[in-house]
């Protein structure tokens, strides 16, 4: 079982060899496409392969902002040729992500296909790591092999790579081991209960609040740190401000997501940025500790 997601992929190429990407769609080149063209071939060691975010079968929804559906294959290919002359293309790609049934906690293995020059899409964090503590996956690139498995998420502990234990392994060494792996990489992962934002831990409830700005401020102050897994919390509310008037947001509440973008593994600066670019309607996913002393 899979679900589809979309992501933006930026490739840098050159007019001679292009981006190393071939598209397939329709029966002949000038036929109007009734569905987006598919990636049918990725040239080895090309920009398309090295980015690690494209796979054969992905649907290309747009090329440099121009929708491919209802166009022709010739038009799509021409857009790619024109983009190669400018050395850069922005693709909007739809892809499948596996719906993995995984426990919210426990230790398990994940196998990922790997090519030498292609990143898996995993960012490892060792921030505030004490001796003997595991490395933490702080980010997973959308569209990457790691993302498409549907099993990995920020906050997962990375215990071993290809049976090499990482107990006292410096982050730099772990990154190097990952880079050098080929064919199939076996990751040993631990998920902890407290890593799951969705899980309603004892005495806590999570819900969503929608705020319409109408050009005005939200009336909230948030605090946290640049450590990726420190919580982002509401530290202040403007008196009679928009957020306070809802009655649903209080100082001390934890923000789990802004406009459906999870804050898991994100530092305070990113959360602030997400709020700044959130637009007129801001949706906040809040986690409230019910047994908090008054």
């Amino acid at each position: 079982i899979v679900h589809t997601e979309t992501t933006e992929v930026v490739l840098c190429g050159d007019p001679l060899s292009g981006f190393g990407l071939q598209l397939q769609g329709g029966i002949f080149a000038t036929e109007t496409l009734s569905s987006p063209p598919l990636v049918c071939f990725i040239e080895p060691d090309s920009p398309a392969e090295r980015c690690g975010l494209l796979q054969v079968g992905d649907r290309v929804l747009s090329i440099n902002g121009i929708a491919t559906e209802d166009g022709t294959m010739e038009e799509a290919n021409q857009l790619l040729r024109d983009a190669a002359l400018a050395h850069k293309v922005v693709l909007e790609v739809e892809f499948d992500v596996a719906e993995s049934v995984i426990p919210s906690s426990g230790t398990f293995h994940v196998k990922l296909p790997k090519k030498r020059s292609v990143e898996l899409g995993i960012t490892i964090s060792s921030a505030s790591r004490k001796r003997g503590e595991p490395l933490i996956i702080s980010d997973i690139k959308k569209g990457s092999v790691a993302h498409r498995t549907g099993t990995l998420e920020p906050g997962d502990k990375l215990l071993a790579i290809d049976n090499i234990r990482l107990d006292n392994c410096p982050m730099e060494d772990a990154v190097q081991i990952l880079r050098q792996c080929e064919d199939l990489v076996k990751l040993k992962i631990r998920k902890d209960e407290d890593n799951s934002d969705e899980l309603e831990t004892t005495g806590a409830v999570s819900y969503t609040v929608e705020l319409k700005r109408y050009g005005g401020p939200l009336g909230i102050t948030i605090s946290g740190t640049e450590e990726p897994f420190d919580p982002i919390v509401i530290s202040g509310l403007t008196k009679r401000g928009l957020a306070e008037r809802t009655g649903a947001i209080h100082v001390g509440d934890r923000i789990l997501a802004i406009n459906n973008v999870s804050l898991k593994g994100r530092p305070l600066s990113e959360a602030i940025h997400l709020l700044q670019v959130a637009g007129e309607t801001v949706t906040l996913k809040i986690k409230k500790q019910l047994d908090r002393p008054l």
Partner: antibody, heavy 117, light 106 residues
Framework: EVQLLESGGGLVQPGGSLRLSCAAS????????MSWVRQAPGKGLEWVSA????????YYADSVKGRFTISRDNSKNTLYLQMNSLRAEDTAVYYC??????????WGQGTLVTVSS | DIQMTQSPSSLSASVGDRVTITCRAS??????LNWYQQKPGKAPKLLIY???SLQSGVPSRFSGSGSGTDFTLTISSLQPEDFATYYC????????FGQGTKLEIK
């Protein structure tokens, strides 16, 4: 391994009908357009008809338009060619081929259709 | 409809020769030109797609070039197994084949 296996060919009288089938395996059938290509004895290749992966779009060569109908059953991984009002000039080996980005990357072994009285 | 004209219709050559077959389209077809090889009693086999891309598993002595209306298939050093009939095919508007070029042993 991609395999295409045609069947249904044979001897038919002018004006008669015949239905060819092509059983596909080794790939996601519904993801690919499919075509029929024919070759008269001692002659070159002639594209006959094509159908999109979903079956929503069909195309025909002028020589068969109005007489032949291409269709597919994605649940059975099978391609069909219904041939009506057959003529002597339709005598040929009929190949089923997988259409991939405006070329044919896999072909069946062909089935012979002979139109004769 | 787009017409495809191959030349020559037949060609005699020897093992080791460099052979060139040309294909001309009645209108511009960009790079939507493919080449096939067919041996007697067998189904055609894709050699070159998109004018110059070598199909997986095809020997590197085969190469294709051209765009617009004029295209060529080149066999750099003819091998005994290369004696066959070669067809070009356009995929720009509908799908049409050239009449074929029969490559025979001299």
């Amino acid at each position: 391994e991609v395999q295409l296996l045609e069947s249904g060919g044979g001897l038919v009288q002018p004006g008669g009908s015949l239905r060819l089938s092509c059983a596909a395996s080794g790939f996601t059938f519904s993801s690919y357009a499919m075509s029929w290509v024919r070759q008269a004895p001692g002659k070159g290749l002639e594209w006959v008809s094509a159908i999109s992966g979903s079956g929503g779009s069909t195309y025909y060569a002028d020589s068969v338009k109005g007489r032949f109908t291409i269709s597919r059953d994605n649940s059975k991984n099978t391609l069909y060619l219904q041939m009506n009002s057959l003529r002597a000039e339709d005598t040929a080996v009929y190949y089923c081929a997988r259409s991939h980005a405006s070329y044919f990357d896999y072909w069946g072994q062909g089935t012979l259709v002979t139109v004769s009285s | 409809d787009i017409q495809m004209t191959q030349s020559p219709s037949s060609l005699s050559a020897s093992v080791g020769d460099r052979v060139t077959i040309t294909c001309r389209a009645s209108q511009s077809i960009s790079s939507y030109l493919n080449w096939y090889q067919q041996k007697p009693g067998k189904a055609p086999k894709l050699l070159i797609y998109a004018a110059s891309s070598l199909q997986s598993g095809v020997p590197s002595r085969f190469s294709g070039s051209g765009s617009g209306t004029d295209f060529t298939l080149t066999i750099s050093s003819l091998q005994p197994e290369d004696f066959a009939t070669y067809y070009c095919q356009q995929g720009y508007y509908l799908l049409t084949f050239g009449q074929g070029t029969k490559l025979e042993i001299k």
